[in-house]
Interface confidence: low
């Protein structure tokens, strides 16, 4: 049997060395001369030569101080042998435990902690958590840590608390105001021995940044503004308004959104934000007319891009201001309004016939006196214009059916000028009233009838005059020869068309058929139709094949 039990020694022992630990004893020493020896870590393994045993006495010694944080314990093996090498005893495992001394300071995991929270947050809001480690023996007072805040900059009032065992920092006030202070610096402490005054302690820094919330409304620096703009100007900036907002610059909590609340029913204005300066830029986007309104009063409002954060705020969530816009008169010269004016004249009116013309006026006086007129364009030179009155006179016969006339209206362009030389232009539309000066006629003079698949063709007449001087038309075969009457029949099918059909089986060939068309007032014209009777299925097949009964392709009667 071995005598020793596990022994211990204090780390960092001051000695004196060699330091006696205990005596190893074997019962076999009563019967034998016993030599004691040891092996293992701290003896013949690293850290070498830390322990030794006296061969004869079994006294166990330590030669130098030990750091528990490096070696918690040593398991060495003790041997009992006789001088001749006989081992009457089994080797003894011997544990030497190194007892902890509070020789390590707790250390924060970070030199500086940085946390961010929003201003105005509720009491008890978690800011963040700090943590420290201690190399001394776990689950002992040497590693039982307590956290605390020992300083705050700016110092007053105390706004944060720290949980002593978890290191969690929370707010103790809801009065965090970024606009007043946007950063706090805490000095924090951790102490072992459960925070008792003799425990080892370390400090660190914790920076708490206060983030902005939109708790300030943008407010106009003035409640009323006066500006002016010349009438008829457009796309111009007429005013810049400024706002104050204590929230964080260049964020959605600070950026302003302007709006026109009242007075812009006609859409003359718009207000936009200058992204660089945050000013409201009031612009005219539709021209103003001094003669209509000399002053306009706008109400403008401003909010932030971000919604306002204060619930149940007693204040309205929008600052407003009034803008008085004085419209300045511009000496505009004559106004051609409406730009298109019309008069009525009979076509074929006699040369020298006069009519009212284009009228321009001075917008300041609403009067036309003193305005001079001149033709700018007159496509066919049919009229002249009176310089003083603007009235027109027929210079050449007016023809409603001329090619230059569209929809019976003849347009001339007029330049009006005042005594100061300012001008405007307008269009005078002369509505030409129709007279029955055109006969109806048949525009399609060539007709192909495929025989025998077709027995007739439709003949359509037109009259350039107004409908009142046009259809219904009267169609008739115009011929003194009985041959035409024998070969052809003509029958009206509506007001503007008739059906021409052949009879008595005429031969293939070309025929001239004269047709008279009369309008409702009896004005008439004769159109000679070229009618081809062809051996074909469709008109496109016709290659003018002549009837073999009449020999060579001569022109038939009436041509």
């Amino acid at each position: 049997r071995w005598a020793p039990i596990p022994c211990s020694m204090l780390e960092n022992s001051l000695g004196p060395f060699p330091l006696f630990l205990q005596q190893v004893q074997s019962d076999t020493a009563q019967n034998y001369t016993i030599y004691y020896s040891i092996r293992g870590p701290g003896v013949d393994q690293e850290p070498r030569n830390l322990f030794y045993v006296e061969r004869d006495t079994g006294n166990l010694y330590c030669t130098r101080p030990v750091d528990r944080e490096q070696y918690e314990s040593f398991e060495i093996i003790a041997f009992a042998t006789t001088p001749d090498g006989y081992t009457p005893e089994l080797p003894l495992p011997l544990i030497i435990k190194i007892e902890d001394e509070n020789d390590n300071y707790p250390i924060f995991t970070e030199e500086t902690y940085t946390f961010t929270i929003f201003e105005n947050c509720r009491v008890g809001t978690t800011v963040g958590q700090v943590c420290a480690t201690d190399k001394d023996e776990p689950d002992t007072m040497h590693t039982r840590l307590k956290y605390s805040i020992i300083g705050q900059v700016p110092p007053s009032p105390t706004l944060f608390s720290m949980h002593p065992t978890t290191g969690v920092i929370t707010t103790t006030s809801s009065q965090l105001d970024r606009e007043l202070i946007d950063k706090y610096q805490l000095k924090i402490k951790v102490q072992d021995m459960d925070g008792q005054y003799f425990g080892l302690q370390t400090t660190s820094t914790c920076i708490i940044n206060i983030d902005d919330v939109n708790d300030h409304l943008p407010t106009f620096t003035r409640t009323s503004y006066v500006t002016s703009v010349e009438e008829n100007t457009v796309d111009v900036e007429i005013l810049r308004v400024t706002v104050e907002d204590k929230d964080l610059v260049n964020t959605a909590n600070w950026r302003a959104n302007y709006t026109i609340l009242k007075g812009n029913e006609n859409g003359n204005f718009k207000i936009v934000t200058d992204a660089k300066t945050n000013e409201g830029v009031l612009c005219v986007v539709k021209p103003l007319n001094y003669e209509e309104k000399q002053q306009m009063i706008l109400q403008i409002g401003v909010v932030n891009e971000a919604p306002f954060s204060r619930e149940a705020s007693p204040r309205s969530a929008m600052s407003t201001a009034t803008v008085t816009v004085n419209v300045e008169d511009q000496d505009e010269g004559p106004e051609c309004n409406p730009p298109i004016q019309t008069v009525r004249m009979k076509e074929n009116a006699e040369v020298g016939t006069t009519s009212n013309g284009y009228k321009a006026y001075d917008p300041e006086t609403r009067s036309s006196s003193g305005i001079r007129y001149k033709k700018l364009t007159d496509p066919t030179g049919w009229v002249t214009i009176d310089e003083n009155t603007g009235s027109i006179k027929v210079f050449r016969s007016l023809d409603r059916e001329a090619e230059t006339i569209k929809n019976g209206i003849y347009n001339i362009t007029v330049l009006a000028s005042d005594q100061g030389g300012r001008t405007c232009t307008g269009t005078l539309g002369i509505i030409l009233q129709d007279v029955n000066d055109n006969s109806p006629f048949i525009p399609k003079k060539t007709v192909i009838i495929c025989k025998p698949t077709m027995s007739s063709a439709e003949i359509v007449a037109v009259d350039p005059d107004e409908p009142i001087h046009g259809p219904p038309f009267d169609f008739s075969l115009e011929s003194s020869t009985s041959e035409v009457q024998r070969m052809w029949r003509l029958k009206a099918i509506n007001d503007t068309a008739a059906r021409l059909s052949y009879q008595n089986d005429p031969p293939f060939g070309s025929y001239v058929v004269p047709i008279t068309v009369r309008d409702r007032l009896g004005m008439s014209s004769v159109t000679s139709l070229d009618v081809t009777l062809c051996d074909c299925i469709t008109e496109n097949d016709c290659t003018h094949r002549v009837d073999p009964r009449i020999g060579g392709g001569g022109v038939q009667l009436g041509k």
């Epitope: 970024r178 606009e179 007043l180 202070i181 946007d182 950063k183 810049r240 400024t242 104050e244 907002d245 204590k246 964080l248 610059v249 200058d274 660089k276 300066t277 945050n278 000013e279």
Partner: antibody, heavy 117, light 103 residues
Framework: DVQLVESGGGLVQPGGSRKLSCAAS????????MHWVRQAPEKGLEWVAY????????YYADTVKGRFTISRDNPKNTLFLQMTSLRSEDTAMYYC??????????WGQGTTLTVSS | DIQMTQSPSSLSASLGGKVTITCKAS??????IAWYQHKPGKGPRLLIH???TLQPGIPSRFSGSGSGRDYSFSISNLEPEDIATYYC????????FGGGTKL
């Protein structure tokens, strides 16, 4: 009424240091960015440094970068300019100015710094 | 960096007359220019910002215009208290003053 009062100027030897202060009143100091601007004798105005309302943004002119430090204490309504490694060409009247959006709308009367041996 | 070239560097004029000062930027500054009046022993005084917007309390004798790189500043009906040095300031990208014009 907005008021800015600079102090801390005086005679400094080349290589020396000096800290200028600017006391602000009459407005919410913590809502406005601030500048330092200087004017050397017989020369024009030269922008030196800028600090935003919450100190989150700072800019320096190339001529002072690495030698000057701008800072502010919002609760005390005070702006600072810490100047080190001073040179004779830093001799000037130093003004602090308030930023209204991006331009300077109010200026102090200035404090004179002379760098000479 | 943006450079501001201000001219002339000095000028004389008669009371009641008109003067014009110009500033040319080394690049487009998007109308972000301000004009200051500086008298000895005082801090500069803001007259105009954003090219042509007059500060409250500044008489309408002072005016500004321009766009792109070219800007001008005028004083009409000159009065004795207008004797000063005038500076332009660009604030489109950081801040640069013109060299000044002594009136």
């Amino acid at each position: 009424d907005v008021q800015l009062v600079e102090s801390g100027g005086g005679l400094v030897q080349p290589g020396g240091s000096r800290k200028l202060s600017c006391a602000a009143s009459g407005f919410t100091f913590s809502s406005f960015g601030m500048h330092w601007v200087r004017q050397a004798p017989e020369k024009g105005l030269e922008w030196v440094a800028y600090i935003s309302s919450g100190s989150s943004t700072i800019y320096y002119a190339d001529t002072v970068k690495g030698r000057f430090t701008i800072s502010r204490d919002n609760p005390k309504n005070t702006l600072f300019l810490q100047m080190t490694s001073l040179r004779s060409e830093d001799t000037a009247m130093y003004y602090c100015a308030r930023v209204h959006y991006y331009y300077f709308d109010y200026w102090g009367q200035g404090t004179t710094l002379t760098v000479s041996s | 960096d943006i450079q501001m070239t201000q001219s002339p560097s000095s000028l004389s004029a008669s009371l009641g007359g008109k003067v014009t000062i110009t500033c040319k930027a080394s690049q487009d500054i998007n109308k972000y220019i301000a004009w200051y009046q500086h008298k000895p022993g005082k801090g500069p005084r803001l007259l105009i910002h954003y090219t042509s917007t007059l500060q409250p309390g500044i008489p309408s004798r002072f005016s500004g215009s321009g766009s792109g790189r070219d800007y001008s500043f005028s004083i009409s009906n000159l009065e004795p208290e207008d004797i000063a040095t005038y500076y332009c300031l660009q604030y489109d990208n950081l801040w640069t003053f013109g060299g000044g014009t002594k009136l």
